[in-house]
């Protein structure tokens, strides 16, 4: 028996508005902002979620070294536009008509222009770098232990399949979790690597999406992870298309 | 999706004990918070006790608390229910129920379950 029809809720995206009003009296779940309905069964797309995010009211808020073409989210949040399956939309504009492209997870990767700015398409961010500092603990972590944790978190609570987890690197109290995902690897119903990586940065900040009541409890071993400082890298497809002024400043 | 068995169900007069247990399968157990619920003829569905995925946080009903004690073995794949001091009220069909997210910290509420057994019927009468 499933719980999820009684209670009428959404387990993977708390930002939602849930009725019994689907085919059957079944509980159909619409996210906010967008209104459009969501898949409770997996994740919802980061494009929808940051839309509900800016809908809602406001609230308080052997190591890797990232390529030079690696974006990190400087921007922060904004309220994009989402296509008719979540997906960002290739440009995003502004109220004030000042208009970027993104790419897949809606980073911008090119300079800020105006309505005449196009984005041919929708670059895919195909490699994530997550860099973490954890506080302080009584010794290290055992590494094969923690890479065995962090690869069943992102199996079991983001329902990532592990092959796109291409690496745990940890030198303490630095820990890198680097996520793989090209085009042609990414399968009808397979969690999108940047949705993943969206759901882990907001339960490690404390921000859980999940409709849980508690938010993330990470352990190695018994002993509690936690993060004092996240960083994410996301590497395109094709490099961004940044002027060098940017570059230089 | 996870199955879950339970087990160790039967007559009890007032004041004696049960052992009640809970075998899961089909999903990777040890990650995920677990609770007895239990249901009385003609009563709504309650909490007895619940169980976090690391064992750090427990909940129990007022009306159990001192008498019953959950408890979980990971290596087993198993949930238990320890019911002492066992009355008449106690009578029900108890179900082992799992949560449907992993890694949440605290105890898990009524709603945060997703799946539960078929229940084990728990008499108490002299």
């Known amino acids: 028996h499933t719980a999820a029809q009684d209670n009428c809720t959404c387990p993977t995206n708390k930002m939602t508005v849930c009725s019994p009003d689907g085919p059957g009296g079944r509980c159909q779940c619409r996210a906010l902002g967008s209104g459009m309905a969501v898949d409770c069964s997996t994740l919802t797309s980061k494009c929808l979620l940051l839309k509900a995010r800016m809908s809602a009211p406001k609230n308080a808020r052997t190591l890797v070294r990232p390529s030079e073409h690696a974006l990190v989210d400087n921007d922060g949040l904004y309220d994009p536009d989402c296509d008719p399956e979540g997906r960002f939309k290739a440009r995003q504009c502004n109220q004030t008509s000042v208009c970027w492209c993104v790419n897949s997870v809606g980073v911008r990767r090119t300079d800020k222009g105006d309505l005449s700015l196009r984005c041919d398409e929708l670059v895919r961010t195909h490699h994530i770098l997550i860099d973490l500092r954890h506080r302080p603990t009584a010794g290290a972590f055992n590494h094969s232990d923690l890479d065995a944790e962090l690869r069943r978190l992102f199996r079991e609570r983001y329902r990532l399949h592990p092959k796109f987890v291409a690496a745990v690197h940890y030198e303490q109290p630095t820990i890198q979790i680097e996520l793989r995902q090209n085009t042609s690897q990414k399968a009808a119903g397979d969690v999108d690597i940047g949705d993943a990586a969206y759901y882990f940065e907001r339960d490690i900040k404390g921000e859980s999406l999940f409709q849980g009541r508690g938010g993330l409890d990470l352990r190695v071993r018994g002993e509690p992870l936690q993060v004092e400082r996240t960083l994410i890298y996301y590497l395109d497809e094709i490099p961004p298309k940044f002027s060098m002024k940017r570059l230089t400043a | 999706q996870v199955q879950l068995l339970e087990s160790g169900g039967g007559l009890v007069q007032p004041g004696g004990s049960l052992r009640l247990s809970c075998a899961a399968s089909?999903?990777?157990?040890?990650?995920?918070?677990m609770g007895w619920l239990r249901q009385a003829p003609g009563k709504e569905r309650e909490l007895v006790a619940s169980?976090?995925?690391?064992?750090?946080?427990?909940y129990y009903a007022d009306s159990v608390k001192g008498r019953f004690t959950i408890s979980r073995d990971n290596s087993k794949n198993t949930l238990y229910l320890q019911m002492n001091s066992l009355r008449a009220e106690d009578t029900a069909v108890y179900y082992c129920?799992?949560?449907?997210?992993?890694?949440?910290?605290?105890?898990?509420?009524?709603?945060?379950?997703?799946?539960w057994g078929q229940g084990t019927l728990v008499t108490v009468s002299s």
């Open positions: 169980i976090s995925w690391s064992g750090h946080s427990t």
């Open positions: 089909g999903r990777s157990f040890s990650r995920y918070g």
């Open positions: 129920a799992a949560e449907s997210l992993p890694y949440e910290s605290g105890s898990p509420r009524l709603t945060d379950f997703a799946s």
